[in-house]
């Protein structure tokens, strides 16, 4: 039996969008179905339908189909938006270009290349002709519009209106030279959908021919829409998995557009002695890698063979030898002409945020007046009269509007970590600038940490060294995995938000992590039936030099008795000594045959100058700091550990504290831990949550 | 105690393919990864990948695909590694060793080596 | 792939000296370095986790220090039973590297 095509990838996909007509004449066919792909194969065919299929839509919660005559674009029709529904458009009726000969076209471009308009299909004024579109089914010979019904060179053609002139061509584009993109098409969102040797392209939302990682729910950014070439990763140009089962994938023939400028919003800030960001931008003249071996030509082949080209990277400034980061590396490398070594980064170009010398602020910066416009990630800040509406959202007072003039960094909510602006990037709605604290200023911008004045607990509610196996309501635990491994702890503190340490991300590949939920073994046995398993859509890192990291999942996990969340103290907030608290790990607990579990070790709270005194003076404890020691001698988090949490409780409610960090050795005697402080992040955490979109459950 | 008991020395023709074995004993054999590190006299210690016995999961150096291929029988407590189309580059000492659980961790036994010598 | 690059190549020392070995990244590896001892004819044996824990049964002559890209072994006072090579490898990036090894000799 022949295997029926999927056809799905014919069609242009609007979620949570349907369609109602307003002209009641309009026909609709409607049935229960599956899924999409059942809809699709008989929208394609015609199967058993009393007009040519252009539209339908998938009824997710009925698991229905509506097929329609007609599309968007159709008169006597309307948008409308629902959660249960999507709309799926065959794209040769709203493609305004054609691929090969245009046999598939099925636009409405009815006016030949000399401009005369085309004579209706179903008359024989002035020309009679044989192209009856009863004897060509299927091929759309509708009206007066521009058709190919037999595949003919010259592309679509009519019967004009002229009887001086029988037919002639219409002037339709190859869809390859409506389509273009800059530089390398990280950025492009056009709607090729087929490759350049002509192979349509899988949608990115199917797993068949190819199963790939590219989700469009995981990377949101990516504009990984229905089945249309895109650069995700870096690739020399947009490319596509292909519907071929034997041709995995390959990539499309997308002109480089004619003004090969990037927009204002893709164009990283360019610097010539030192790195932004991730040095994107970098564009100076190092050519050595960090420990002075020289870097290889961008040009040659020798002695590392690459395509990282200055021909394949256009916009890159791949010139001569030197250091570029062109790939969205942590910061820019070469190849290098050791042929023993083949990439190395170049650490030691200084980093911008260090070199700002005159500009800086005091206190927490709210009355900073530079003129920087720039996020620390090099993104350009955007104009605070366009955002007054989101500021608004998370402040309850009046700003100051003659301080937010034009797109600078400025701190009007009293940010306690400085000044900050909106980017107009949306996965990214705005970030802090990198300006750092004058020098000298010792402005406390949180008072009194040893005393307590603020309670931690907002209402009166209800791995580890040598810990204790724990399987109490511990449901806000979460395993961060790399690559299939654990490597760090991170509490749910929100169904779609995880608090973690920024250690735990070697690879910037965030395919290359899931967050795993509900467990209580390392390795997820015996918990088959509470483990949630979710992937990593963003990492937000934290206020410089606070080692904290917000993960956003891919999607929100589901509360129930396995998976909570865990409460976040308030602001600026002290515990009183000596209060008992616990981290949990999966990490290193120096047993020879570790059973997996998660485990708990006691600590209670120290103040921060008794704390400096343990550590012989070596270590002076600032505001962002916690300190706890261990009640057990020996026993606190270690490697594996790190991202978790110091638990603690107050007026009967628990609260995560602390995050564990990399530090001093681990459980050593009567050497305390040191944890990043919560409460000194907490605006911060809930400015992110209050601002960054997340995926609807 | 804790031990990892390698096969024994192994003398190959070019071409052909070996399996070195890495038996454990003294701990709970599908919670730990294998690591595989590969040593040439003047080449200092090479990661070549790693297995946890419990699931199968594999991570590989890049340079070691098609290479070396991991596998493990957790009934035997036994760990395998596959080493194909042998070349001369392929002579060395090669150890198993016991990982940790979670990434990053370091490797607490090992075993006492296998050494493979390629020639014709 | 990051590189671990191990200072010196090898050393000679006398019983009761102290010996530094250093070990520097190519990027930033946190604290994820571990210091391997390597006598003649036999297999590595872990001395250091995490870049500044001794392990279990190690001698508190040997201790190492460092975070992100350098880091030290040392050893307080040398012993004849410590001629060895020490190799120091990074477990935070893919693939796992060490460095080429310190050859330490006793005089």
């Known amino acids: 039996q022949r295997k029926r095509r999927n056809t799905i990838h014919e069609f242009k996909k609007s979620a949570k969008t349907t369609l109602i007509k307003i002209d009641p004449a309009l026909k609709i066919k409607t049935k229960k179905v599956n899924t999409a792909d059942q809809c699709a194969n008989r929208c394609t065919r015609n199967k058993g339908l009393p007009f040519t299929c252009k539209a339908f839509v998938f009824d997710k919660a009925r698991k229905q189909c509506l097929w329609f005559p007609f599309n968007s674009m159709s008169s006597g029709v309307k948008k409308e938006f629902g959660h249960e529904f999507d709309l799926y458009e065959n794209k040769d009726y709203i493609r305004n270009c054609i691929i090969g000969k245009g046999r598939s076209y099925k636009g409405t471009v009815s006016i030949t290349k000399s401009g005369i308009k085309c004579q209706p299909w179903s008359s024989m004024i002035p020309h009679e002709h044989s192209f009856l579109p009863s004897s060509y089914r299927g091929k759309d010979l509708q009206e007066n519009y521009c058709r190919n019904p037999r595949g003919e060179e010259g592309g679509p053609w009519c019967f004009t209106s002229n009887p001086e002139v029988r037919y002639e061509v219409c002037d339709i584009p190859q869809c390859s030279e409506v389509e273009c993109m800059t530089c390398n098409g990280e950025s492009y969102r056009g709607l090729m959908d087929h490759t350049e040797s002509g192979k349509i392209c899988q949608r990115w939302d199917h797993q068949t021919p190819h199963r790939h990682k590219f989700l469009p729910e995981r990377y949101p950014d990516k504009g990984f829409d229905d089945n249309y070439c895109r650069n995700p990763d870096g690739q020399p140009r947009p490319w596509c998995y292909t519907l071929d089962p034997h041709t995995r994938w390959e990539y499309c023939a997308i002109k480089t557009c004619a003004d090969n400028t990037m927009n204002d919003t893709d164009v990283p800030l360019e610097t010539t002695e030192c790195i932004q960001g991730q040095g994107e931008g970098y564009r100076g003249t190092v050519n050595t890698i960090w420990n002075g071996i020289p870097c290889q030509r961008w040009d040659s082949q020798y002695p590392h063979e690459h395509d990282m080209t200055p021909e394949n990277f256009k916009c890159k400034d791949l010139r001569e030898n030197y250091c570029r980061n062109p790939d969205g590396s942590e910061s820019p490398w070469c190849f290098t002409t050791d042929p023993n070594i083949r990439v190395g980064y170049c650490s030691q170009i200084p980093n911008c945020d260090m070199s700002h010398g005159q500009d800086c602020y005091r206190g927490n910066g709210k009355n900073y007046m530079g003129n920087l416009s720039q996020t620390r990630s090099g993104l350009t800040c955007s104009m605070w009269d366009k955002n007054m509406e989101d500021l608004h959202r998370h402040i309850f007072w009046e700003p100051d509007a003659s301080k937010l003039n034009e797109n600078y960094c400025r701190n009007p909510d009293d940010d306690a970590h400085g000044p900050w602006c909106y980017t107009g990037n949306p996965l990214i709605p705005w970030d802090y600038c990198p300006i750092s604290r004058c020098e000298g200023d010792t402005t406390p911008t949180i008072v009194n940490l040893d005393h307590p004045v603020i309670s931690c607990a907002k209402t009166k509610q209800l791995r580890v060294v040598n810990g204790i196996p724990t399987r109490t309501n511990i449901g806000w635990m979460v395993s961060l995995r790399y690559r299939n491994k654990h490597i760090c702890g991170g509490s749910l503190i929100k169904e779609s938000w995880v608090l973690t340490a920024r250690q735990c991300f070697p690879s910037r590949d965030l395919k290359d992590y899931e967050a795993w939920l509900g467990i209580h073994d390392v390795h997820g046995r015996g918990d088959e039936k509470c483990k949630q398993v979710l992937n990593v859509s963003q990492l937000v890192y934290g206020p410089e030099g606070s080692d904290l990291v917000l993960m956003k999942l891919a999607r929100p996990a589901v509360l129930d008795d396995f998976v909570s969340t865990i409460d976040l103290p308030n602001y600026g907030c002290t515990i009183p000594e000596k209060t008992s608290c616990s981290v949990y790990g999966w990490g290193y607990t120096g047993l020879i045959n570790y059973d997996g579990l998660l485990r708990v070790a006691h600590l209670y709270i120290m103040g921060n100058e008794k704390c400096s005194q343990h550590h012989r003076g070596k270590v002076t404890l600032n505001e962002s700091e916690i300190c706890a020691g261990a009640e057990k001698i020996g026993s606190g988090p270690c490697e594996g550990d790190y991202g978790g949490p110091l638990v603690c409780e107050q007026h009967k409610m628990r609260m995560v504290l602390g995050v564990i960090v990399p530090g001093r050795g681990c459980a050593i005697p009567n050497r305390p831990g040191i944890f990043v402080r919560v409460a000194y992040y907490a605006k911060w955490i809930h400015k992110i949550i209050l601002t960054y979109k997340v995926p609807q459950s | 105690q804790v031990q990892l008991q390698q096969s024994g020395a192994d003398l190959m023709k070019p071409g052909a393919s070996v399996k070195i074995s890495c038996k454990a004993t003294?701990?709970?054999?599908?919670?730990?990864?294998i690591e595989w590190v590969k040593q040439r006299p003047g080449h200092g210690l090479e990661w070549i990948g790693e297995?946890?016995?419990?699931?199968?999961?594999?991570n590989y150096n890049e340079k070691f695909k098609g290479k070396a291929t991991f596998t493990a029988d957790t009934s035997s407590n036994t760990a395998y590694m596959q080493l194909s189309s042998l070349t001369s580059e392929d002579s060395a000492v090669y150890y198993c060793?016991?990982?940790?659980?979670?990434?990053?961790?370091?490797?607490?036994?090992w075993g006492q080596g296998t050494t493979l010598t390629v020639s014709s | 792939n990051i590189v671990m690059t191990q200072s010196p190549k090898s050393m000679s020392m006398s019983v009761g000296e102290r010996v530094t070995l250093t070990c520097k990244a190519s990027e930033n590896v946190v604290t994820y370095v571990s210091w391997y001892q390597q006598k003649p004819e036999q297999s590595p044996k872990l001395l250091i986790y995490?870049?500044?824990n001794r392990y279990t049964g190690v001698p508190d002559r040997f201790t190492g220090s460092g975070s992100a890209t350098d880091f030290t072994l040392t050893i307080s006072s040398v012993q004849a039973e410590d001629l060895a090579d020490y190799h120091c490898?990074?477990?935070?990036?893919?693939?796992?590297?060490f460095g080429g090894g310190t050859k330490l000799e006793i005089k």
């Open positions: 003294g701990y709970t054999f599908s919670g730990n990864w």
């Open positions: 995490g870049a500044s």
């Open positions: 297995i946890l016995p419990g699931s199968g999961n594999t």
């Open positions: 490898g990074q477990g935070y990036s893919y693939p796992y590297t």
């Open positions: 060793a016991r990982g940790g659980h979670y990434y990053g961790s370091s490797w607490d036994y």
